[in-house]
């Protein structure tokens, strides 16, 4: 069955998909969609790329990695719930049914709405001190190690640091799984 | 308006190769996968080939390496290469286009052309 | 491969009549929520033309009086009042897996 990940609405999402270039630039056309994968093709294409680059996308849906390197993971700006769903990942590599093909579900849940009382509260709660990583399938999840002591004068830096990383796009209520692979 | 239009038809004899040709016109080519559909004499429709938009490609078990699909997304076009032909597969052939988005069944549809294989 | 038994083999029906041709697959076609499953229609000298798709889609341009519906394995095409033009050899075909297979086809001919 399908890989579960999760968004706030509001939130950027992020959805891996990896294959690896026979060769540097050696590049393999990747289509996205909305929907599960049929069976020759992407579904509602979101966005596609070809042997050189990206040839096609719509707004909010864009790759933020390298795809020169065959990182084609998905990132979707600002989500609603609308866009919660299956997506599927299609590497369409040459050959005789050579294809793979990756359904990927996407849960998005409202926005948390909480009182302001302290600042370091709400950055606890927003960010628990355990992060891990995951890799290509769902048992590969490794820890990251744990947050040291935060004080409030790290709490910016952090955040600003943590907003322009991708690994924020997927940062989760429970345990802040961070996909990367 | 969408048409696709097929010739490379004729006679051959078995064990020999032809080569068909499906001209596509009225929507962007490359966006869809294109199929090739046949059927014999006074039988039902068997599906024997499919390219992907992305060029990956699929066959039955009673084709395989045999026949093989390609495309010119440049000339809009969609090909069939036969080759070890054998009496069974004399065929009416269709070039089919997938439906956008999926693929596996087909919006569209050529006239058909004839291959006959005997001796 | 997904086996596609069509019945009966051929229907015969007077005009204005209703006709219900049937299609089996031997294992499931529901993926996702959606049956892949279609329909097409298919006149003597003529290529096949697709009037259901996802089971119970109607294609543009196809006739109201055409309907598709079932789920699973059982599938069912119905045309509720038959016209003269609608005399032909009825396919349906699998989208689940490769190979693609079409039913063997309903010959509906006038009574």
């Known amino acids: 069955s399908e890989v579960e990940y999760r968004a706030e609405v509001g939130q950027n999402a992020y959805l891996p998909c990896f294959y690896t270039p026979a060769a540097p630039g050696n590049l393999v056309p990747v289509c996205w969609g909305k929907g599960a994968c049929p069976v020759f093709e992407c579904g509602n294409v979101v966005l596609r790329t070809d042997e050189r680059d990206v040839n096609y996308w719509t707004s909010r849906y864009w790759l933020n990695g390298d795809f020169r390197k065959g990182d084609v993971s998905l990132t979707i700006e600002n989500v609603t719930l609308a866009d919660s769903g299956i997506y599927c990942c299609r590497i369409q590599i040459p050959g005789i049914m050579n294809d793979e093909k990756f359904n990927l579900k996407l849960v998005i849940k409202p926005a948390k709405v909480t009182p302001a009382p302290t600042l370091q509260r709400d950055f606890t709660a927003a960010f628990p001190r355990m992060l891990t990583t995951r890799g290509h399938g769902p048992a590969e999840t490794q820890t990251l190690g744990s947050l040291p002591d935060i004080n409030l004068t790290q709490i910016s830096t952090l955040a600003n640091e943590l907003r322009d990383s991708r690994l924020a796009n997927d940062l989760r209520d429970s345990g802040a799984t961070i996909r990367i692979g | 308006e969408v048409q696709l239009v097929e010739s490379g038809g004729g006679l051959v004899q078995p064990g020999g190769s032809l080569r068909l040709s499906c001209a596509a016109s009225g929507f962007t080519f490359s966006r869809y996968a294109m199929s090739w559909v046949r059927q014999a004499p006074g039988k039902g429709l068997e599906w024997v080939a499919a390219?992907?938009?992305?060029?990956?490609?699929y066959f039955p078990d009673s084709v395989k390496g045999r026949f093989t699909i390609s495309r010119d997304n440049a000339k809009n076009s969609c090909y069939l290469q036969m080759n070890s032909l054998r009496a069974e597969d004399t065929a009416v052939y269709y070039c089919a286009r997938g439906r956008e988005a999926d693929g596996g069944y087909f919006d569209y549809w050529g006239q058909g052309t004839l291959v006959t294989v005997s001796s | 491969d997904i086996v596609l038994t069509q019945s009966p083999a051929t229907l015969s029906v007077s005009p204005g009549e209703r006709a219900t041709l049937s299609c089996r697959a031997s294992e499931s076609v529901e993926y996702y929520g959606t049956s892949l499953m279609q329909w097409y229609q298919q006149k003597p000298g003529q290529a096949p033309r697709l009037l259901i798709y996802a089971a119970s889609n109607v294609e543009s341009g196809i006739p109201a009086r055409f309907s598709g519906s079932g789920s699973g394995t059982d599938f069912t095409l119905t045309i509720s009042s038959l016209q003269s033009e609608d005399f032909a050899v009825y396919y349906c075909?699998?989208?689940?897996?490769?190979?693609?297979?079409f039913g063997g086809g309903t010959k509906v001919e006038i009574k």
């Open positions: 390219i992907s938009s992305g060029g990956s490609l």
């Open positions: 075909q699998q989208s689940m897996k490769v190979p693609l297979t």
